[in-house]
């Protein structure tokens, strides 16, 4: 591994240790539960593909933050606290990715079934943009993908 990466990893590690990502987890869980309440829990109802054009932030310019204020109407208290925490990673895309991966890992046991997992992942992908932040590149949210041997 390269020197910058070792230094970067250490810096990121301490950032992750300082961060409180719980509000993000709570915000996302509340969101998918609200969605389930709205649409019902029928597993056979047509669910959107997690990468469908209307859902995937990459279909828009991936670097244009969400047009609405993160404290706008309807945004939960959890979301605001979550965005404040994620803001700490704005200048380190790799670390932003690790923070999002950590959120995914922390919640993976609580997600019931493939559909709920995909829904959570979809909301997680939208989270940086909701917070007015850039979404990371080269970031795999698959929990089962295992450790990464970078370069």
């Amino acid at each position: 591994r390269q020197q910058w990466e070792l230094q970067g990893d250490r810096r990121c590690q301490s950032q992750l240790e300082r961060a409180n990502l719980r509000p993000c987890e709570q915000h996302l869980m509340q969101k998918i539960q609200r969605d389930e309440d709205s649409y019902g829990r029928d597993p056979y109802s047509p669910s959107q593909d997690p990468y469908s054009p209307s859902q995937d932030p990459d279909r828009r310019d991936p670097y244009s933050p969400s047009p609405y204020d993160r404290r706008g109407a309807g945004s939960s208290q959890h979301q605001e606290r979550c965005c404040n925490e994620l803001n700490e990673f704005e200048n380190n895309q790799r670390c932003m990715c690790e923070a999002l991966q950590q959120i995914m890992e922390n919640q993976s046991d609580r997600l019931q079934g493939r559909q709920q997992e995909q829904q959570f992942k979809r909301e997680l992908r939208n989270l940086p943009q909701q917070c007015g932040l850039r979404a990371p590149q080269r970031c795999d949210l698959e929990v089962e993908s295992g450790g990464r041997d970078r370069y």
Epitope: D58, Y63, R138, E142, R148, D149, Y151
Partner: antibody, heavy 121, light 108 residues
């Protein structure tokens, strides 16, 4: 519109080094990673590595790890590829390619016109 | 390391359908992108993110994947489709970009 303009052709002797530049316009340089891809005559595309101009972070393909250096100058919106210890096998067209996508989606919409590097004694 | 395998060449008569495959272990879990390269030119993305066709590419071109195979399909082939085609993925395990070896499409 997005433009990537590369430096001209180069001829080098075996053992020498070469530096190729890629000057960009039409977008915010630090917002996207720059990749380098090469293509030997009659061969396929080969990814060499990338640089994040915002952080200066680099990542190189295993094969080139020991002799490639990727840098960028944000004031000039320019990325550079330097390859040392050249052999005839390094004769190729070298392309810069700007990244696109988020999360697992990672591909190249914008490419430079290519720079031919010829290694010959 | 992750390897993408493409057939070196595919020949097709005008008006027929060309299918270019890209094989790799469990490619269905990867995001596959396709490029077209004409002689003396830089590659151009034709399909990104498995099946999202580039705006400059006609509807005759489409991408799909299943199991260990991703496929680029060109229907109603024209002379202008003659080119080299490459598949590409980002491999998260090694954090490397990987290209297939390329397929030369010849219109008979």
């Amino acid at each position: 519109q997005v433009q990537l303009v590369q430096s001209g052709p180069e001829v080098r002797k075996p053992g020498a080094s070469v530096r190729v530049s890629c000057t960009t316009s039409g977008y915010t340089f630090i917002d996207y990673e720059m990749n380098w891809v090469r293509q030997a005559p009659g061969q396929g595309l080969e990814w060499m590595g990338l640089i994040n101009p915002h952080s200066g972070d680099t990542g190189y393909a295993q094969k080139f790890q020991d002799r490639v250096t990727m840098t960028s100058d944000t004031s000039l919106s320019t990325a550079y590829l330097e390859l040392s210890g050249l052999t005839s096998e390094d004769t190729a067209v070298y392309y810069c390619a700007r990244s696109q996508g988020t999360f697992e989606v990672y591909y190249f919409v914008s490419w430079g016109q290519g720079s031919l590097v010829t290694v010959s004694s | 390391s992750y390897v993408l395998t493409q057939p070196p060449s595919v020949s097709v008569a005008p008006g027929k359908t060309a299918s270019i495959t890209c094989e790799a272990k469990n490619i269905v879990r990867k995001r596959v992108h396709w490029y077209r390269q004409k002689p003396g030119q830089a590659p151009v993305v034709v399909v990104s993110d498995d099946e999202d066709r580039s705006s400059v590419i006609p509807e005759r071109v489409s991408g799909s994947k299943s199991g260990d195979t991703a496929t680029l399909t060109i229907s109603r082939v024209e002379a202008g489709d003659e080119a080299d085609y490459y598949c590409q993925v980002w491999d998260s395990t090694t954090d490397q970009v990987v290209f297939g070896g390329g397929t030369k499409v010849t219109v008979l």
